[in-house]
């Protein structure tokens, strides 16, 4: 695993503890909360970040639902179980033995049950819609400039290949960024769209996860783009399984 060697810190994850105890005295960084060694040349998985965040919990996220299959993160923060690669385990349980199934971004996709609940596989979130509202500006942003700037941002800040940024829609003051990444499209080493969306969300809220990189300074042709609200919708490769009772509530 890689990390800054000069002062032994993790550029891509400030929620780590680093020490020069790796092979050959190299700097090695471990995520808070889990102790899992992280690769500091790329984004840390959301599961490990959530686990680290539980040591200093903040306001929970609330997401909304654009259609019948999109998921809402109504449950807020929880202390997740991560697999050895740092991905969410398909089944999550709390301390009172209440369990539920989650998708690859850790959002609940079934009703809550008990310890007998089975979650056969981790279902991939393959389509993420980031819905932003920007603060009033003198005029609307030029759509193609905005599109190029957001694609550049996801490439250069989060190392997400532009092929995974399916579209950028704009109707002042609403900006929608569509991220798409099927299981078959994601190669080894590719940043996961869920992780990129989570880093972006934290950046927009002024809670950057990067170490010493400075906060997000989004500008379109020199004009600051200031976000005043963010909603994120998640769509899974397999639709979620909720009871009719929940759907009609």
């Amino acid at each position: 695993h890689t990390a800054a060697q000069d002062n032994c810190t993790c550029p891509t994850n400030k929620m780590t503890v680093c020490s020069p105890d790796g092979p050959g005295g190299r700097c090695q960084c471990r995520a808070l909360g889990s102790g899992v060694a992280v690769d500091c040349s790329t984004l840390t998985s959301e599961c490990l970040l959530l686990k680290a965040r539980m040591s200093a919990p903040k306001n929970a996220r609330t997401l909304v639902r654009p259609n019948e299959h999109a998921l809402v993160d109504n449950d807020g923060l929880y202390d997740p179980d991560c697999d050895p690669e740092g991905r969410f385990k398909a089944r999550q349980c709390n301390q009172t033995s209440v369990c539920w199934c989650v998708n690859s971004v850790g959002v609940r996709r079934t009703d809550k049950g008990d310890l007998s609940l089975r979650c056969d596989e981790l279902v991939r979130t393959h389509h993420i819609l980031i819905d932003l509202r920007h603060r009033p500006t003198a005029g609307a942003f030029n759509h193609s400039d905005l599109d190029a700037e957001l694609r550049r941002l996801f490439r250069e800040r989060y190392r997400l290949h532009p092929k995974f940024v399916a579209a950028v829609h704009y109707e002042q003051p609403t900006i929608q960024i569509e991220l798409r990444q099927n299981t078959s499209q994601k190669a080894a080493g590719d940043v996961d769209i869920g992780d990129a969306a989570y880093y972006f969300e934290r950046d927009v809220k002024g809670e950057s996860l990067f170490q010493g990189r400075g906060g997000l300074d989004l500008r379109v042709r020199g004009e600051p783009l200031q976000v005043e609200r963010t909603l994120i919708y998640y769509l899974d490769e397999i639709p979620p399984k909720f009871s009719m009772k929940r759907l009609t509530a």
Partner: antibody
Framework: QVQLQESGPGLVKPSGTLSLTCAVS?????????WSWVRQPPGKGLEWIGE???????SYNPSLKSRVTISVDKSKNQFSLKLNSVTAADTAMYYC????????????WGQGTLVTVSS | DIQMTQSPSTLSASVGDRVTITCRAS??????LAWYQQKPGKAPKLLIY???SLESGVPSRFSGSGSGTEFTLTISSLQPDDFATYYC??????????FGQGTRLEIK
């Protein structure tokens, strides 16, 4: 086999515009790669100029950004470089290259074309 | 911008020698580093990417290592075809692409 071939005038006058084209064969310009220009002044090291993605996204070296334009022509499977307000310091071997990865490292290169800036 | 510094600038060695070229980055670049070989009058050729991954078709006597700010290119047993100039290149995501100044490997 991926091949890149630079073409364009070998002599440009000071304050003029340097224009080069890179023809790509063995790969589609619309593949998920980056298409870059790199230059090398005589007897010196390599300098990245900038790159383009098939959708038109560009990224330029900040030291040259105000003078550089890179464009792509998908119908001809080629991309181009324009560098304006040239001086003798822009005399160099100009290479086009295919960039792999999210941020580019260069796995295929053209053979290069020498551009001299002189009156 | 991230500065890349190679050492030595010139290296004299003999066929069969084990040689090492070092590249230092002015700040951490993770493992986003590539190595190239360039012969006079020719375009550079990719040898190593992501600090230690060998490009397809490159002989296994070439290897790369390092992370963060310090990297090395090693040629385990120098062959006559290996005398050339070698460049490192960083492709970290938050800085324009930059190359080292080059290391000339010459026959002793």
């Amino acid at each position: 086999q991926v091949q890149l071939q630079e073409s364009g005038p070998g002599l440009v006058k000071p304050s003029g515009t340097l224009s080069l084209t890179c023809a790509v064969s063995g790969d589609s310009i619309s593949s998920h790669n980056w298409w870059s220009w790199v230059r090398q002044p005589p007897g010196k090291g390599l300098e990245w100029i900038g790159e383009i993605y098939h959708s038109g996204i560009t990224s330029y070296n900040p030291s040259l950004k105000s003078r550089v334009t890179i464009s792509v022509d998908k119908s001809k499977n080629q991309f181009s470089l324009k560098l304006n307000s040239v001086t003798a310091a822009d005399t160099a071997m100009y290479y086009c290259a295919r960039g792999s990865g999210v941020i580019s490292y260069f796995d295929y290169w053209g053979q290069g074309t020498l551009v001299t800036v002189s009156s | 911008d991230i500065q890349m510094t190679q050492s030595p600038s010139t290296l004299s060695a003999s066929v069969g020698d084990r040689v090492t070229i070092t590249c230092r980055a002015s700040q951490s670049i993770g493992n986003w580093l590539a190595w190239y070989q360039q012969k006079p009058g020719k375009a550079p050729k990719l040898l190593i990417y992501k600090a230690s991954s060998l490009e397809s078709g490159v002989p296994s006597r070439f290897s790369g290592s390092g992370s963060g700010t310090e990297f090395t290119l090693t040629i385990s047993s120098l062959q006559p075809d290996d005398f050339a100039t070698y460049y490192c290149q960083q492709y970290d995501s938050y800085s324009p692409i930059t190359f080292g100044q080059g290391t000339r490997l010459e026959i002793k």
